[in-house]
Amino acid sequence: AGVFELQIHSFGPGPGPGAPRSPCSARLPCRLFFRVCLKPGLSEEAAESPCALGAALSARGPVYTEQPGAPAPDLPLPDGLLQVPFRDAWPGTFSFIIETWREELGDQIGGPAWSLLARVAGRRRLAAGGPWARDIQRAGAWELRFSYRARCEPPAVGTACTRLCRPRSAPSRCGPGLRPCAPLEDECEAPLVCRAGCSPEHGFCEQPGECRCLEGWTGPLCTVPVSTSSCLSPRGPSSATTGCLVPGPGPCDGNPCANGGSCSETPRSFECTCPRGFYGLRCEVSGVTCADGPCFNGGLCVGGADPDSAYICHCPPGFQGSNCEKRVDRCSLQPCRNGGLCLDLGHALRCRCRAGFAGPRCEHDLDDCAGRACANGGTCVEGGGAHRCSCALGFGGRDCRERADPCAARPCAHGGRCYAHFSGLVCACAPGYMGARCEFPVHPDGASALPAAPPGLRPGDPQRYL
């Protein structure tokens, strides 16, 4: 779990000729607000598709009235950050849409007057816990300057907010292979560390220190393609009679992959792993630059400004290959037992267990409360063959050992500030907003929401509703 934070620095005319007209006037003063929509991966989805990672709406900015004859300056902005909480792992690659909306403050007797001024979108890679990333985007004659970052909420840490911090078992140091959990130095990080040298592309681990290979790869570090390793050593794949499997003619015989590509057999045919600068079924397409978009499945292309220099595809979790063309599906092996849900996080497998089961692979049947301790005043509750800890206020997790942060899961709307409280959370609303989560504007000025859209018109389209 964590929070994506967006700081708008300025919104105003971009450089160059053709300065935009001021969005406000002396007759119709207005104010701005912003909406951010986040989607996982590097998808180029339509603007109206769901904000699967989350979304947020800012408070209203100060009222602005155009000065006659003056050029449109940077417009006054709302205070504070836009915060988008995320419950699961931070995906590392994401798409964003930032919309600038204008709210007109003239006496609107009829319906709302609410119009979209600018919409920018982009696709980025971002590690959680890193520094603020600065960005400039242009929409027509407007320019938006902003910074963003993703940060984990305790007890989660790491670039994807998937590693957890735990209180130290010994007062002086962490256990073997465990590091202090910055910035919570009194706690220990519990990362999943594979065997040193285990291929990050072709290997994975379910227990610390191991290296298990994806289909088509072998060797202690999963660096050897199966098709070239069969029978190269006496310990290769063997049968009881011959001691070695000698394959018949296969689709990789004669290596159909051009330009130095390596061939591996698939159940139906073959697959070429191409060197950088080449792609295609047989690595026959060359002279590729990032401008050609060689990275598939949302891979981020780096380098390769001209045909002579190589490019590198940085693949999002769940994909591999020199062009991110291969999907990694380790859940197809059904590693989670007892009906557990398999989650492939890219760098590791996780099983989300059904009630009553636990363990890395949901292998433990938790049939009663015997021998189970709930920390921090929590009580064990059993029922239906399952049991759980009912935690005291302020604590959460399976054993009530995690400090619960109610603000991480329930944000306040319209720029409201969230405070953890012994009874849950409190939203301190920006002026002009009410509700447990600041979701109700007291005086919407006829302008703070989308009307029921006429047929064929979606909320969020840049029409003006009157």
Epitope: R35, C37, C51, G54, A55, L57, A413, E439, L450, P459
Partner: nanobody, 117 residues
Framework: EVQLVESGGGLVQPGGSLTLSCAAS????????IAWYRQAPGKKRELVAG???????VYVDSVKGRFTISRDNAKNSVYLQMNSLRAEDTAVYYC???????????WGQGTLVTVSS
């Protein structure tokens, strides 16, 4: 896409009662924060009462003790029970929904309430 349809408005005498309904479609009302606003002729639209997605409620001072907002998840509707109505309660009443997933607010088309003898 969230659609809101208000009903239940009409003419009522001072001191009388009325119940407004807001039927939502496109998503479950339990996922929304829903409020009633009103706009009297020549005045700005103002909040009357709201119910958050967690069930907590909020009222403006002028209607506390007289109006009650409630939610029926099975019927996917939110209601405003208005008692002890006064002439100053005359207005067009609008249903408003705040959809948390996409941080988008929506309006209904409004229903007229007239309090007059």
């Amino acid at each position: 896409e969230v659609q809101l349809v208000e009903s239940g408005g009409g003419l009522v005498q001072p001191g009388g009662s009325l119940t407004l309904s807001c039927a939502a479609s496109g998503t479950a009302v339990s996922n929304l924060s829903i409020a009633w606003y009103r706009q009297a002729p020549g005045k700005k639209r103002e909040l009357v009462a709201g119910i958050s997605d967690d069930g907590s409620t909020v009222y403006v001072d002028s209607v506390k003790g007289r109006f009650t907002i409630s939610r029926d998840n099975a019927k996917n509707s939110v209601y405003l029970q208005m008692n002890s109505l006064r002439a100053e309660d005359t207005a067009v009443y609008y249903c408003y929904a705040y959809e948390w997933t996409n941080a988008l607010p929506y309006w209904g088309q409004g229903t007229l309430v007239t309090v007059s003898s």
